[in-house]
Amino acid sequence: FKVATPYSLYVCPEGQNVTLTCRLLGPVDKGHDVTFYKTWYRSSRGEVQTCSERRPIRNLTFQDLHLHHGGHQAANTSHDLAQRHGLESASDHHGNFSITMRNLTLLDSGLYCCLVVEIRHHHSEHRVHGAMELQVQTGKDAPSNCVVYPSSSQDSENITAA
C-alpha cells in the first residue's frame, strides 16, 4: 500500500481551523491478523529523508495522536488530552485519515507528516508516510480561509517505506 497526500501546502490565516489529510492507497489486507497504526507528527524539512525526525504537535507526541484499528475501519481520537490542545485525528472507511488543528497560531507553521504502520501480528511491520507543509499567515495578505495547493502526482504518492 501507499500513502497519498492530496495537498502539499496549506496556507491558513491565524485563528482558523485546518484539517490536514492523508489517504491510504492500494490493496489493504483486511485479515484478522492485520492492524493499522496511523499517526501524525511534525518534522524538520530533511534534505535527504523527509519525515525522518519526529517532533510533537502542540506538545503531543505521535503516540498521543495515534489511531489503531483494522483495515479501512473508521476511528478517531477521543483523547481529552488531544482535544484540550485543539487537536483531533480521525480515519474513515475509505482510507482517508486526518488531523484537525483548531485556532491556528503562527507557531503551528511547519512540516507535518502522517505515518501508517501496517502491523502483521507475529510478523513484520510495513511503514509509509506522507508530508505536507502548513503556513499560518497574519495580516492583510493572509487568506480569509485556508487555501490548499494540490500535490503533484509524483508527490501525492509520497511513498517512503521503512
Epitope: E14, G15, S44, R45, G46, E47, L106, L107, S109, G110, Q135, Q137, T138, G139, K140, D141, A142
Partner: antibody, heavy 120, light 108 residues
C-alpha cells in the same frame, strides 16, 4: 510609510524600561511587527514578534525577559528588569516585503533604532 | 532553535572584485532565508528574500542562492558603497527568526 522607536535612555539595573515603536502610514492590524536588538559592536539579535491579530511570540532566550504589546498605532517592548547585557540599540521592524505581510519574506521596514543603556 | 552559521566574519576585496558570503543552517529551512546590509549607525536594509529574490532597488550585482542548507550571497563588481556588514536571517519560523553572526565587507 515609516516606523520610529523611542524610549531609549539610561537606566540602572532592575529599573523597568519601555520602548515604543510608532507606525506611520500603515495599520498595525495589517502587519506583524518585530523587535530586534544590537549590542554595541555586535550582531543582530531577534527578540520577538506581535502578529497582526495581536498574538505575541518570543525567541526562546527572550521568553520571560521581554513583553511585547500594541495599540492601534504603537508597539511596545517592555523590559521589566534590565541587566547590563540588555544595553543595546533596539530596532522595530515591519514583517513582510514591501506591501506584502508574508511572514516568510523578512523584515522590510525598519526604524532608526533607540539606544538603551543599563548601568549602575 | 535553528542556528545560522555565517562565514567569513570579515572579508576584504578591491573595487571591482567579488565577495562570497556563506550561511549554513543547522537544519533544513527550505528557501526561507533573507539577507540584509547594514552600514554603521543605520538600521539593516533588506537585500534578498526567499533565498534568491532581489528586493526592489537592489542592484543585480547582488545575488542569492541556495544549495540544501547552505546559502550564498555573492556581490560582484564591488563598489565602495558596498562596504558594510551583511547578515543572513532565517525566516522559516517565528521562534527561529535567527540571524547569522554577520560578515564585515571591506572594499579596498
Amino acid at each position: 510609510q515609516s516606523v520610529e522607536e523611542s524610549g531609549g535612555r539610561l537606566v540602572t539595573p532592575g529599573t523597568p524600561l519601555t520602548l515604543t515603536c510608532t507606525a506611520s502610514g500603515f495599520s498595525l492590524s495589517d502587519y506583524a511587527m518585530t523587535w530586534v536588538r544590537q549590542a554595541p559592536g555586535k550582531g543582530l539579535e531577534y527578540i520577538g514578534i506581535i502578529s497582526a491579530g495581536g498574538y505575541t511570540y518570543y525567541a526562546s532566550w527572550a521568553t520571560g525577559r521581554f513583553t511585547i504589546s500594541k495599540t492601534s498605532t504603537t508597539v511596545d517592548l517592555k523590559i521589566p528588569s534590565p541587566t547590563a547585557e540588555d544595553a543595546a540599540t533596539y530596532f522595530c521592524a515591519r514583517v513582510g516585503y514591501a506591501d506584502s505581510s508574508d511572514i516568510y519574506k523578512g523584515f522590510y521596514l525598519w526604524g532608526p533604532g533607540t539606544l538603551a543603556t543599563v548601568s549602575s | 532553535d535553528v542556528v545560522m552559521t555565517q562565514t567569513p566574519a570579515s572579508v576584504s576585496e578591491p573595487v571591482g572584485g567579488t565577495v562570497t558570503i556563506k550561511c549554513q543552517a543547522s537544519e533544513s529551512i527550505s528557501n526561507y532565508l533573507a539577507w540584509y546590509q547594514q552600514k554603521p549607525g543605520q538600521p539593516p536594509k533588506l537585500l534578498i528574500y526567499l533565498a534568491s529574490t532581489l528586493a526592489s532597488g537592489v542592484p543585480s550585482r547582488f545575488e542569492g542562492s541556495r544549495s540544501g542548507t547552505e546559502f550564498t550571497l555573492t556581490i560582484s563588481d564591488l563598489e565602495c558603497a558596498d562596504a558594510a556588514t551583511y547578515y543572513c536571517h532565517c525566516t522559516d519560523s517565528i521562534i527561529n527568526y535567527n540571524f547569522g553572526g554577520g560578515t564585515e565587507v571591506v572594499v579596498k
